[in-house]
Amino acid sequence: DAHKSEVAHRFKDLGEENFKALVLIAFAQYLQQCPFEDHVKLVNEVTEFAKTCVADESAENCDKSLHTLFGDKLCTVATLRETYGEMADCCAKQEPERNECFLQHKDDNPNLPRLVRPEVDVMCTAFHDNEETFLKKYLYEIARRHPYFYAPELLFFAKRYKAAFTECCQAADKAACLLPKLDELRDEGKASSAKQRLKCASLQKFGERAFKAWAVARLSQRFPKAEFAEVSKLVTDLTKVHTECCHGDLLECADDRADLAKYICENQDSISSKLKECCEKPLLEKSHCIAEVENDEMPADLPSLAADFVESKDVCKNYAEAKDVFLGMFLYEYARRHPDYSVVLLLRLAKTYETTLEKCCAAADPHECYAKVFDEFKPLVEEPQNLIKQNCELFEQLGEYKFQNALLVRYTKKVPQVSTPTLVEVSRNLGKVGSKCCKHPEAKRMPCAEDYLSVVLNQLCVLHEKTPVSDRVTKCCTESLVNRRPCFSALEVDETYVPKEFNAETFTFHADICTLSEKERQIKKQTALVELVKHKPKATKEQLKAVMDDFAAFVEKCCKADDKETCFAEEGKKLVAASQAALGL
């Protein structure tokens, strides 16, 4: 339904508070380096303009598209050229090319200072002094660091952030109340950002069909009692929502997400028995709850798929008539029967089935050709099952930190050209799969582990895309979305890699390491481990373990010393010499 003024339409639908928050998120995700005050000024100007359009939809410029209005506003920033360089060239383009240009300049790893958490009293004072500015600053800081963060979900995080401060700033022990809540929000926020980044990569790099296939599989697992037509409708609507958010159309995205939540709750009887509690919540909580809702129970009786997808004489006829619908039905039927499979495994099975039909439906005897298609699924199912079993055993044996180190060594040997910070970040996240998923019973391990690994490997892919250094990473990232994990798993040691020159400076440590948190100290040690492997890719596990044990002892010893800095200088030289000898450098 066409509206005379799109901006007025969205302002009325979303309300002033959400409108302003979403415009701020949109601007901060596009212009990631701009100061907070500049963004607030731009948002206020857009809001005032929107209000004039609400009052009179025929007013000047009110009929312009949101991209035109927002793009024009962003292009008024005086320092665009000096701050963003070639991104300023986007402003010479017309819509829709201008918006595409802005999207291409989003930076997954912007050069921004790490967010340092002030003292609790300082935060509480700032919160009480100006709650609105305090919360806007939160939106701004998260949005500019995570340019693909799912905007309506960020509103939910901001609501929880506000609730934490409201409650804890009046508590007897403010810190004990607030800090765990902020830690939880930070960890959940990073996870949410990474999950959304995969959705956007799926849409942008592999197209709508790839995203829809993912959505069919996931929603069929979650809503196994829903009819295929119902799942298809939800998939279409969900695809629209994510296409909008990934495309920077945050107002439309938030509005459509609210409509989708409303539809799901109005039709929960034909969707899932697990939605009742979610649907009683306010909008932001409701949408979040639906997105995280547990899988419904499977219908009591589901027949074998063989009759419709292997034994029927009409398989090729049904496939030819509507390929994607038939494959969608196959995926739906398979996924609703297998909540114990990862989505990516289900998509591999569907791809195998599609490839078989493409080949067999052109053969002399199609039925004879595809009769044993499900035998081809066995190795595809067993590969992730075995990998998860092995890695969970290793995790249980080593614990999280040492398991991360094993993965650091494994991945540095596979792709040593990748930057050390990226290898550390990605391997640490890969290692978290252990504590996240290995505690689950067998039936929940694979969907937990493999779908989580897809999210983490996508981080590697988007960071690598910014500055490509490894053909192997590019190949695994671009060839097939669903085979990324098997592709990386299959990589062996890169024999073509020329070891990095030894640089003693890399292994020089100072007393400041003693004041770091346990997590930051781990990152320092893991950074050193990656560098060691880059210098000596053929080093054995035993050699690396010996050096890392010496390193840990060295840090512990010097942090206990009276003159820490001298200890680090003198003992550090000895450690470097001993490590070189141990590794034959």
Epitope: M298, A300, D301, L302, P303, S304, L305, A306, E333, Y334, R337, H338, P339, D340, Y341, F374, F377, K378, V381, E382, E442, A443
Partner: nanobody, 124 residues
Framework: DVQLVESGGGVVQPGGSLRLSCAAS????????MGWFRQAPGKEREFVAA????????YYADSVKGRFTISRDNSKKTVYLQMNSLRPEDTALYYC?????????????????WGQGTLVTVSS
């Protein structure tokens, strides 16, 4: 967890009948697809028959269609395989299996729990 114990095997003449039973202990079987597989000496394990959770759907290997009937009694936690018109090629060790999730019924990798087997010999 589910423990499965098969019984009812034995020696029978060609054309004869046998009824195999599979008794489950531990968890209830109503949330499992139940199946029968068999393995003849020197051959791979092959699918025979399977039945959906509440018994509404059955599925058979082509080689036993019309001769074998699978059924279940969830209240007794037992699955049955009625085998009629037995042939020498039906000689095998017959295994009962339970799978919480199954798309195909016929694929052994979709089954989580297995019995030890009961021997069926068809010979004159």
């Amino acid at each position: 967890d589910v423990q499965l114990v098969e019984s009812g095997g034995g020696v029978v003449q060609p054309g004869g009948s046998l009824r195999l039973s599979c008794a489950a202990s531990g968890s209830t079987i109503s949330s499992y697809v139940m199946g029968w597989f068999r393995q003849a000496p020197g051959k791979e394990r092959e699918f025979v028959a399977a039945i959906s959770r509440s018994g509404g759907y059955t599925y058979y290997a082509d080689s036993v269609k019309g001769r074998f009937t699978i059924s279940r009694d969830n209240s007794k936690k037992t699955v049955y395989l009625q085998m009629n018109s037995l042939r020498p090629e039906d000689t095998a060790l017959y295994y009962c299996a339970a799978g919480r999730y199954s798309a195909w019924y016929s694929q052994s990798y979709e089954y989580d729990y297995w019995g030890q087997g009961t021997l069926v010999t068809v010979s004159s």
